[in-house]
């Protein structure tokens, strides 16, 4: 941070030290030096001497004027030329900032990732403000009218343990900086409706050695309660389009899904489930890559190094896609 300096005078800014970008700005310098009747007063911005738009107002005071100031941040200081002194004498310094009032936060969403213990709310902050802007998330119980506030930057994690006022809430975010304040629209949430179930896991795959080779995918849904509706999507890695297989299940143990696939091909599998009566699907599971054997008579056997490396790499790349947008196709 900037070290404070002992001023031998005063420096001030009109309309203020923080102002709207594009405004005309005047920076004033008033010296109070002992044994000095300054020949000149000089202004420096970010360490560079200003050459233009400097006005000497009186013996002790000068002003520099900026038309349409558009620097997000600048450090100003002023000096005096004192007769008989070789160097300029420092008078005072000031940090100035320009920016914008905040936009009203938009597209607010709140979700509870299963087992996280938090309600995560995000929003669009709008155009950059360039100045320090605080966001306060307001959570109001529709049952008890109790209201809580959480300070944030561009998202917030609220412990579900702190949401003691029932299941229904109003949530909104307020953006505040030195130039203004805006509120988002209010979002009504029911805690049970915003749970994003944790993803299912595909644990392994095997292709049986038979006349018509059959691939079995082993997977487990983490949804514990009641009936579950699941989808498994799969495609050859060379293809763009997915095939989707649907399942109704109420099992919590490992599932087996059978597929009849082309030999000597690399396939990617993903699964997701939705509890009946629930709004939210799980995100797609991490991509699982399986290579089918060359012919019907050949038993699957992986060389120990190279293919595994490829699978890991593929999964990593896919994961980046699938987690950023659950509906987005992969590959």
């Amino acid at each position: 941070g900037i070290a404070t300096i002992n001023c031998s005078g005063n420096m001030w800014v009109e309309p203020g030290e923080i102002f709207q970008m594009g405004m005309n700005v005047s920076v004033y310098c008033q010296e109070a030096l002992k044994n000095c009747r300054p020949r000149n007063l000089h202004f420096y911005k970010n360490g560079f001497k200003e050459r233009f738009h400097i006005t000497r107002i009186n013996r002790t005071t000068a002003r520099v004027w900026y038309k349409g100031f558009s620097e997000p941040h600048a450090s100003m200081y002023c000096t005096a030329e004192c007769p008989g002194r070789f160097q300029e004498t420092l008078i005072c310094g000031k940090d100035i900032s320009s920016g914008y009032p905040p936009d009203a936060p938009s597209n607010m969403t709140c979700v509870i990732y299963e087992y996280s213990g938090n309600m995560t709310c995000t929003w669009n902050t709008g155009k950059p403000t360039y100045i320090d802007t605080k966001y306060t998330v307001h959570v109001k119980s529709l049952e008890t009218e109790e209201q809580q506030q959480y300070l944030a930057s561009n998202y917030v994690n609220i412990s579900t343990d702190s949401l003691q006022g029932g299941r229904k809430y109003l949530v909104w975010v307020q953006a505040v900086n030195a130039l203004g304040m805006e509120n988002s629209q209010q979002l009504q949430v029911h805690l049970d409706d915003i749970v994003i179930p944790s993803p299912s896991i595909i644990s392994r795959a095997e292709t049986t050695n038979a006349n018509v080779p059959k691939t079995i995918i082993y997977w487990k849904s983490k949804i514990m309660t009641g009936k579950v509706f699941c989808e498994m999507r799969y495609k050859a890695t060379t293809n763009q389009t997915w095939n989707v297989k649907e399942f109704d299940t109420n099992y919590t143990y490992v599932q087996q899904s059978e597929f009849y696939l082309e030999p000597n091909s690399k396939y990617v599998f993903q699964v997701r489930c939705q509890g009946t009566g629930k709004r939210n699907w799980q995100p797609w599971s991490s991509p699982f890559v399986h290579q089918t054997p060359q012919t019907a008579s050949q038993v699957t056997s992986k060389p120990p190094h190279e293919p595994q490396k490829i699978e890991m790499l593929t999964a990593t790349i896919f994961k980046g896609h699938s987690t950023s947008d659950n509906s987005q196709d992969i590959g």
């Epitope: 070290a3 300096i5 911005k45 970010n46 360490g47 620097e71 420092l90 000031k94 940090d95 360039y130």
Partner: antibody, heavy 122, light 111 residues
Framework: EVKLVESGGGSVKPGGSLKLSCAAS????????MSWVRQTPEKRLEWVAY????????YYPDSVKGRFTISRDNARNTLYLQMSSLRSEDTAMYYC???????????????WGQGTTLTVSS | DIVMTQSPASLAVSLGQRATISCRAS??????????MNWFQQKPGQPPKLLIY???NQGSGVPARFSGSGSGTDFSLNIHPMEEDDTAMYFC?????????FGAGTKLELK
């Protein structure tokens, strides 16, 4: 963690042009003045360009004035150096550097990128 | 332009001993009661790293064995005790006025 990553270097013939980029992360880019500094094959360091936080003020040494243009895009957190009429003496490693003020009047290059190499040769 | 002259061009120091690098400016780099003199360390394949600013202030995370002194035109960087990791090039730089200028560097090696 403050990170500056330069790109765009390469080989150019004398009289040619090239644009360097520097992607900044880990700090509020728009609040800092920035510079480009180059290092010759003989390891000499030379400051070549300065830009203010909003891009309104730029300064250059005489050796590159009129040939180099520094600019920035605060929305993209990126600093640029457009170089034209290149000469063999411009051959160097080009670093982007963040300029921090420790007082209103004392500024220091406190973080540097890893650099990108420019070779000017016929 | 302010010319910065560094000496020696190279220096070999034993582990635990003191290394002293000097830098002379062609004119005073003092103003407002401080010296606009900075020191950088550069290891092979890496960018310069700020060690000392305003002649004697340590940069962030810089070990206490690095210290700077001087004013006006004459400055020095001291490293004591010398460690293996200190093998590098060292540059002085003035930030008093543009163009900001650097010394030619001192190569510090382990004896």
């Amino acid at each position: 963690e403050v990170k500056l990553v330069e790109s765009g270097g390469g080989s150019v013939k004398p009289g040619g042009s090239l644009k360097l980029s520097c992607a900044a992360s880990g700090f509020t880019f728009s609040r800092y003045t920035m510079s480009w500094v180059r290092q010759t094959p003989e390891k000499r360091l030379e400051w070549v360009a300065y830009i203010s936080t909003g891009g309104g003020d730029t300064y250059y040494p005489d050796s590159v004035k009129g040939r180099f243009t520094i600019s920035r895009d605060n929305a993209r957190n990126t600093l640029y150096l457009q170089m034209s009429s290149l000469r063999s003496e411009d051959t160097a490693m080009y670093y982007c550097a963040r300029r921090t003020s420790y007082s209103y009047y004392n500024y220091v290059f406190d973080y540097w990128g890893q650099g990108t190499t420019l070779t000017v040769s016929s | 332009d302010i010319v910065m002259t560094q000496s020696p061009a190279s220096l070999a120091v034993s582990l635990g001993q003191r290394a002293t690098i000097s830098c002379r400016a062609s004119e005073s780099v003092d103003n407002y009661g401080i010296s606009f003199m900075n020191w950088f360390q550069q290891k092979p394949g890496q960018p310069p790293k700020l060690l000392i600013y305003a002649a004697s202030n340590q940069g962030s995370g810089v070990p206490a064995r690095f210290s700077g002194s001087g004013s006006g035109t004459d400055f020095s960087l001291n490293i004591h005790p010398m460690e293996e990791d200190d093998t590098a090039m060292y540059f002085c730089q003035q930030s008093k006025e543009v163009p900001w200028t650097f010394g030619a560097g001192t190569k510090l090696e382990l004896k």
